[in-house]
Interface confidence: low
């Protein structure tokens, strides 16, 4: 349904508050270095223009596309070339190339200062003084640091952020009320950003077909009672929503997501019995709730898959005449029967099935050729099961911090060329799989663990893509989306790596470490551990453990000393000498 003015259409659909918030998110995700005030000015100008179009859709420029309007506005920024360098060249292009150019310059690791949380009283005063500016600043700071954050979901986070301040700033103990809520929002926000980043990478690097396959598998697990035609419709609509958001079309994305939530709730009888509570909530909560809803119960007495996909005489005929629909049906039928499998495993099985049919349907006796295809699935299923079992045992034995350290050593030996901050960040996140998933019963472990690992490894892939340093990382990241985790798991120690020269400065610590939070102190120690492995990749677990134990004792001792700085200087030298001796550096 064509509208005379797209900007007026979206303004009316979304309402002024959401319109302004989404335009701010879009601009902050494109121009990540621009000051807050500049973005607010641009957003206000766009909003005033949208209002003129609502009043008269035939007014000048109201018929222009949103990309044209927003791109023109972004290109008015005076300091574009000084701040963004070659990104300014985008402005010389015409749509749609200009928008594509902006997208290519999104930075997953922008050089921005870490967000420091002010004192609670300071935050509450700012909230009460100007609530609107306070909440806009939240959107701006998150959006510029997470340029692929799922925009309609960020509106939901902002709503919760506002609710936290509204409640806690009038509580007797403001800090006790507010800080746990802010911690929860921060952690959930990071997880949400990483999950969406994988969706965008899937669409942008592997195409719509890859994303649709992922969606068929996930929705079939979640809605096993829904008909294949229903799942197909949801997949088509969901793909459109995420394509729009990943492409910077945030107004269309938010509008279409609302339509999809409405459709799901109007048709919940034929989708899932678990949607009732979600569908009673307001829009933002409803969409979030649907996205997180638990899997429905599997229908009773589902027939064997073999009948339609192995034993039927029509397998090759069905496959030849409608390949993607037939494979989609296979994936749907397999996924709805296996909520205990990870989505990536289901996609590997579908790929194996597809490869077998490609080969066998050209053979002299196709049925004889593909008759044992399900036997090929066994090792594919057992590999993640065994890996998760082993790693959960290790996690339960070591606890999260030491489990992260084991992964730090493992991954630094696999890909020592990767920057130390990236190795620390990724390995810490990989290590969180233990506390996140190992507590689950067997039937929920694999979907929890392997799909989470896909999200974390995608962080490694997008960070590495910005500054590629390892052919092995590039290979694992680009060859197959669903085989990334097995590819990284299969990497052994990189024998070609030339150890880093020893630099005493890397292992020099100061009294400021004593005032850090436990998390920050862990990161300091883990950074040192990565550097140690880079210097001595052949060091044994026992050698590394001994050095790390000495290091922990050194920090504890000096943080208790009266003259901390002197202790760190003198004892630090001794520790470095002892470590060099222990590791033979």
């Amino acid at each position: 349904d064509a509208h005379k003015s797209e900007v007026a259409h979206r303004f009316k659909d979304l309402g002024e508050e959401n319109f302004k918030a989404l335009v701010l998110i879009a601009f902050a995700q494109y121009l990540q270095q621009c000051p807050f005030e500049d973005h607010v000015k641009l957003v206000n100008e766009v909003t005033e223009f949208a209002k003129t179009c609502v009043a008269d859709e035939s007014a000048e420029n109201c018929d222009k596309s949103l990309h044209t309007l927003f791109g023109d506005k972004l290109c008015t920024v005076a300091t574009l070339r000084e701040t963004y360098g070659e990104m300014a060249d985008c402005c010389a292009k015409q749509e749609p190339e200009r928008n594509e150019c902006f997208l290519q310059h999104k930075d997953d690791n922008p050089n921005l200062p870490r967000l420091v949380r002010p004192e609670v009283d300071v935050m509450c005063t700012a909230f009460h003084d100007n609530e609107e500016t306070f909440l806009k600043k939240y959107l701006y700071e998150i959006a510029r640091r997470h340029p692929y954050f799922y925009a309609p979901e960020l509106l939901f986070f902002a709503k919760r952020y506002k609710a936290a301040f509204t409640e806690c700033c009038q509580a007797a103990d403001k800090a006790a009320c507010l800080l746990p809520k802010l911690d929860e929002l921060r952690d959930e926000g990071k997880a949400s950003s990483a999950k969406q980043r994988l969706k965008c990478a899937s669409l942008q690097k592997f195409g719509e077909r890859a994303f649709k396959a992922w969606a068929v598998a996930r929705l079939s697990q979640r809605f096993p009672k829904a008909e294949f035609a229903e799942v197909s419709k949801l997949v088509t609509d969901l793909t459109k929503v995420h394509t729009e958001c990943c492409h910077g079309d945030l107004l269309e994305c938010a509008d279409d997501r609302a339509d999809l939530a409405k459709y799901i709730c109007e048709n919940q009888d034929s989708i899932s019995s678990k949607l009732k509570e979600c569908c009673e909530k307001p829009l933002l909560e409803k969409s979030h709730c649907i996205a997180e809803v638990e899997n429905d119960e599997m229908p009773a007495d589902l027939p064997s898959l073999a009948a339609d996909f192995v034993e039927s005489k029509d397998v090759c005929k069905n496959y030849a005449e409608a390949k993607d629909v037939f494979l989609g049906m296979f994936l749907y039928e397999y996924a709805r029967r296996h909520p205990d499998y990870s989505v990536v495993l289901l996609l590997r099985l579908a790929k194996t099935y597809e490869t077998t049919l490609e080969k066998c349907c050209a053979a002299a006796d196709p049925h004889e050729c593909y008759a044992k295809v399900f036997d090929e699935f066994k090792p594919l299923v057992e590999e993640p099961q065994n890996l998760i079992k082993q790693n959960c045992e290790l996690f339960e034995q070591l606890g999260e911090y030491k489990f992260q350290n084991a992964l730090l050593v493992r991954y630094t030996k696999k890909v020592p060329q990767v920057s130390t901050p990236t190795l620390v960040e990724v390995s810490r996140n990989l290590g969180k799989v233990g506390s996140k998933c190992c507590k689950h019963p067997e039937a929920k472990r694999m979907p929890c663990a392997e799909d989470y690992l896909s999200v974390v490894l995608n962080q490694l892939c997008v960070l590495h893509e910005k500054t590629p340093v390892s052919d092995r990382v590039t290979k694992c990241c680009t060859e197959s989306l669903v085989n990334r985790r097995p590819c990284f798991s299969a990497l052994e120690v990189d024998e070609t790596y030339v150890p880093k020269e020893f630099n005493a400065e890397t292992f020099t610590f100061h009294a400021d470490i004593c005032t850090l939070s436990e998390k920050e102190r862990q990161i300091k120690k883990q950074t040192a551990l990565v550097e140690l492995v880079k210097h001595k990749p052949k060091a044994t677990k026992e050698q590394l453990k001994a050095v790390m134990d000495d290091f922990a004792a050194f920090v504890e001792k000096c943080c208790k000393a009266d003259d901390k700085e002197t202790c760190f200087a003198e004892e630090g030298k001794k520790l470095v000498a002892a470590s060099q001796a222990a590791l033979g550096l």
Partner: nanobody, 115 residues
């Protein structure tokens, strides 16, 4: 986009007949086996009948054998269910599905058998 649209339901007296149709689009209809599934009020979905892609092989649930006939016209992308000697216990929403799935579709057509 895969779509299935059922029609032909209605109110009929016991012993009467109805013919249901299912118009399919968005996929190569002639390549897939199809089924009819029904769901009576307050009950789970029940598989009724299936037909292979060419229309040669047909299967029926014991409860409808001899009374119902499934057929298809691949040139029209349409599936049919001819229902004779209808009984009150045949009252349900009828859905067509791709393959031999017992899950229900999104629309369906209501068949009510009552005097």
């Amino acid at each position: 986009e895969v779509q299935l649209l059922e029609s032909g339901g209605g109110l009929v007296q016991p012993g009467g007949s109805l013919r249901l149709s299912c118009a399919a689009s968005g996929f190569t209809f002639g390549s897939f086996g199809m089924s009819w599934v029904r769901q009576a009020p307050g009950k789970g979905p029940e598989w009724v009948s299936a037909i292979d892609s060419g229309g040669a092989d047909t299967r029926y649930a014991e409860t409808v054998k001899g009374r119902f006939t499934i057929s298809r016209d691949n040139s029209k992308n349409t599936l049919y269910l001819q229902m004779n000697s209808l009984r009150p216990e045949d009252t349900a929403v009828y859905y067509c599905t791709i393959g031999r799935s017992t899950s229900r579709g999104s629309q369906g057509t209501l068949v009510t058998v009552s005097s």
